[in-house]
């Protein structure tokens, strides 16, 4: 069975969060997709969304967030550029399907942004994460105002029995330091 999980990304100020959410191609290819933040005890807040209908490989930029929907692959790419400490939080991708509630995608992203300049010359960090070339065609899409009451933050279980961390041989040079935490089975 599919597990809803959290993946933790620990990044520095100025870097870029670069993630993907996959969806069922046949069902949701042209549906409008959104990137949401979930604050403790609150309903998810939509930060950016694709156009309606969603256009293939067409970057949509809302502030520092860039969404790109690869219809023919069932992938939504999300980039948050020039990260700030206050961007730390829990994020998720959803698919809008009115009049039904938004459909939540796997996985949730736990973003932790810390202080510290990451672009020092000669550092082993991936400096690509610091600067992003803004796509030549960007659109600000209008997002539906409703949010889903079902997706209020739920704390992960206390047990760590099912927690898996990255394999020891993986070296991601601090760019995507990821810890996977199942939220529920």
């Amino acid at each position: 069975a599919t597990k809803l999980t959290e993946e933790k990304y620990e990044l520095k100020e100025g870097q870029t969060l670069d993630v993907k959410c996959d969806y069922t191609l046949e069902k949701f290819a042209s549906s409008q997709k959104a990137w949401q933040i979930i604050r403790d005890g609150e309903m998810p807040k939509t930060l950016a969304c694709t156009e309606r209908p969603s256009k293939n490989s067409h970057p949509v930029q809302v502030g520092r967030i860039i969404l790109e929907d690869y219809h023919d692959h069932g992938l939504l790419r999300v980039r948050m550029v020039n990260l700030q400490v206050e961007d730390s939080g829990l994020y998720q991708c959803v698919i809008y399907q009115p009049p039904k509630e938004p459909h939540m995608l796997f996985d949730r992203i736990r973003l932790v942004v810390t202080k510290g300049f990451s672009g020092t010359p000669g550092s082993n960090e991936n400096s690509t994460q610091n600067v992003y070339k803004i796509p030549p065609t960007t659109t600000k899409a209008l997002c539906p105002l409703y949010t889903s009451p079902r997706t209020v933050t739920q704390a992960p279980p206390k047990s760590t029995a099912d927690v898996s961390t990255p394999d020891s041989e993986i070296n991601l040079t601090n760019v995507t330091d990821i810890i996977r935490v199942p939220v529920f089975n």
């Epitope: 599919t2 999980t5 993946e7 993907k20 996959d22 796997f106 996985d107 898996s164 991601l172 996977r180």
Partner: antibody
Amino acid sequence: QVQLVQSGAEVKKPGASVKVSCKASGYTFTSYDINWVRQATGQGLEWMGWMNPNSGNSGSVKKFRDRVTMTRDTSISTAYMELSSLRSEDTAVYYCVRLIGYSSAWKWSFQHWGQGTLVTVSS
Amino acid sequence: DIQMTQSPSSLSASVGDRVTITCQASRDISKYLNWYQQKPGKAPKLLIYDASNLETGVPSRFSGSGSGTDFTFTISSLQPEDIATYYCQHYDNIPITFGQGTRLEIK
């Protein structure tokens, strides 16, 4: 350690289908996407597509879209790639590959490779 | 689709030589570029990811540099075991594509 063990070589007739398996061990199977890459004899590498073993979702490049099916059986940590309507130009070694980062990362770096499965299409 | 052009397609060098392979993308791919080594009859092996990061366990004689459209892969001192075909691969967007490969042999 991470291991991807693929099924053995296959000889198929044009028009037939082939299903290649890829058994993963040494890591949590549902945490990392599996990709498929093929290589015709003496040729370069060609990316076919990806599958998220957790969600079961997958995607493939246009040229394979109508002919390829990527599935998995999480109970035995195995991914499958089925290619139908085979033609002679599908003769190649097919590799399953695990990415460097977890499923949500946009990090398409092919870190762990299976040993490859030679599929020969001949009448 | 983004085209990746490697040059040269083949090269011959002596043990101890500095060897350089280039890869050019048909458009800006930032640093979304990997390098692989493939020995005859074997699966490819990831050497460099994100243009310049050395994969764990890969000897330090291998290095990568570049960003945007132009990338370079270097072997600082060629060893006999480095005889292989080398491929670049981008992942700036979908679909992912590889260069056509550079065959490296010993003089």
